[in-house]
Interface confidence: medium
């Protein structure tokens, strides 16, 4: 696969991952109540997220409450907020860095420095994935720990919510995408012969024999 193809695929994965991370960050389903006592008639389900908690009635009616005070929040929620939002914002920065270093854009002049910019974009996305992974795993650890804690009442036990799964999928996409972007740029820094001349009109590569794309000429 050529460096440009790796670049495009990596960027697409990172964008999907970024979208997934924003979704996971906003969804209230980080923790959902687990009903293990079958004698209890499930009247309602409780969801807990980073920004709000929701109660869903068996009728389908949902009532959500945004957390009032930051100070009243647990340390893990505050840390998860900070890390997840940081990851989302950093991914936004990474997007511009990646686009600047992309072979099909002109905002950074072609030349050796451009490969380094592309590599930086990939590394930033990789870091975004790792940054987002911390609160997700932290929350998952709390859920598991409390679930198996005999002191936790049965009706107060939580299990993994959809947001955690979306978040994990998003971090996987960010890290894989970041790796592909790094590979695309690394292919070029390590194997300059694979960094073909860029045709901004229609990104294509010359043939191995050194013939140039005729579209490039007037």
């Amino acid at each position: 696969m050529g460096s440009a193809a790796l670049e495009i695929l990596g960027l697409v994965l990172c964008l999907v991952g970024w979208g997934g991370l924003i979704l996971a960050c906003g969804l209230p389903m980080w923790q959902v109540t687990a009903f293990l006592d079958h004698n209890i008639v499930t009247a309602q389900t409780t969801w807990k997220g980073l920004w709000m908690s929701c109660v869903v009635q068996s009728t389908g009616h949902m009532q959500c409450k945004v957390y009032d005070s930051v100070l009243a929040l647990s340390t893990e929620v505050q840390a998860a907020r900070a890390l997840t939002v940081s990851a989302v914002l950093l991914a936004f920065v990474a997007l511009f860095v990646t686009l600047a270093g992309a072979q099909c854009t002109t905002c950074v002049a072609p030349g050796p420095a451009k490969a380094r910019v592309a590599l930086t974009g990939g590394v930033l996305y990789l870091f975004c994935g790792l940054l987002a992974l911390v609160p997700l795993c932290w929350f998952a650890n709390i859920v598991v720990r409390e679930f198996y804690d005999p002191m936790t009442p049965v009706n107060a036990r939580y299990e993994f919510g959809q947001a955690l799964y979306i978040g994990w999928a998003a971090t996987a996409l960010l890290m894989v995408g970041g790796c592909l972007l790094c590979c695309g740029a690394w292919v070029c820094t390590g194997r300059p012969d694979l960094s073909f001349p860029v045709k901004y009109s229609a990104p294509r590569r010359p043939t191995a024999t050194g013939d140039y794309d005729k579209k490039n000429y007037v």
Epitope: Q103, T106, C107, A109, P110, G111, P112, A113, K114, A115, C188, T189, G190, R191, P192, D193, S195, F196, P197, V198, K199, Y200, S201, Y212, N216, Y217, V218
Partner: antibody, heavy 119, light 107 residues
Framework: QVQLKESGPGLVQPSQTLSLTCTVS????????VSWIRQPPGKGLEWMGV???????EYNSTVKSRLSISRDTSKNQVFLKMNSLQTEDSAMFFC?????????????WGQGVMVTVSS | DIVLTQSPATLSVTPGESVSLSCRAS??????IHWYQQKSNESPRLLIR???QSISRIPSRFSGSGSGTDFTLTINGVESEDLSVYYC?????????FGSGTKLEIK
């Protein structure tokens, strides 16, 4: 067919400014970069600078303070302006097509124009 | 700046024999080296790009190899028309730099 042709004065007075033009045919400057390279008599090649397809420029530090490269995309011309010329600046000046990419080289060259700096 | 050292400065060969021209970089530059041929009173001509990639319209007797700091241009079966100066050029870092050249003489 791709062609580059340099033009300008053959003789320049010391401390004066050199102005050269590279007229390009067969390719568009909007999608192609052009470098200037010089070669003093009996010596090797020295890259002076480039004007990229996006209009950005890069210069060799040895001439950066005295050199300016610009272009007119409508006329398909690239210009070199170099001030405070000295006798050691006497050289054959070439313009060359530089394919855009991370690692540039020169695939089409002009025939060159000889510039002598002398009073 | 990356310095390219070419050796030998002059090489005398008889037509038909094979020759190797050397270019050494002052630091690792992967495969971002390009070779040019300059005949007397002519402009340079690109022979090889990225250390080993051949260019169309260039005779197949010209080939390149190497990676890192050491590069070689090989001419298999030198012909009298190959009498020229050969330059290597790096594009790993700006400024782009050329070697001092190797002059090929025909015995």
């Amino acid at each position: 067919q791709v062609q580059l042709k340099e033009s300008g004065p053959g003789l320049v007075q010391p401390s004066q400014t050199l102005s050269l033009t590279c007229t390009v045919s067969g390719l568009s400057l909007i999608r192609n970069s052009v470098s200037w390279i010089r070669q003093p008599p009996g010596k090797g090649l020295e890259w002076m600078g480039v004007i990229w397809s996006n209009g950005g420029t890069e210069y060799n530090s040895t001439v950066k303070s005295r050199l300016s490269i610009s272009r007119d995309t409508s006329k398909n011309q690239v210009f070199l302006k170099m001030n405070s010329l000295q006798t050691e600046d006497s050289a054959m000046f070439f313009c060359a097509r530089t394919p855009d990419g991370y690692y540039p080289y020169f695939d089409y060259w002009g025939q060159g124009v000889m510039v002598t700096v002398s009073s | 700046d990356i310095v390219l050292t070419q050796s030998p400065a002059t090489l005398s060969v008889t037509p038909g024999e094979s020759v190797s021209l050397s270019c050494r970089a002052s630091q690792g530059i992967s495969t971002s080296i390009h070779w040019y041929q300059q005949k007397s009173n002519e402009s340079p001509r690109l022979l090889i790009r990225y250390a080993s990639q051949s260019i169309s319209r260039i005779p197949s007797r010209f080939s390149g190899s190497g990676s890192g700091t050491d590069f070689t241009l090989t001419i298999n079966g030198v012909e009298s028309e190959d009498l020229s100066v050969y330059y290597c050029q790096q594009s790993y870092n700006l400024p782009l730099t050329f070697g001092s050249g190797t002059k090929l003489e025909i015995k």
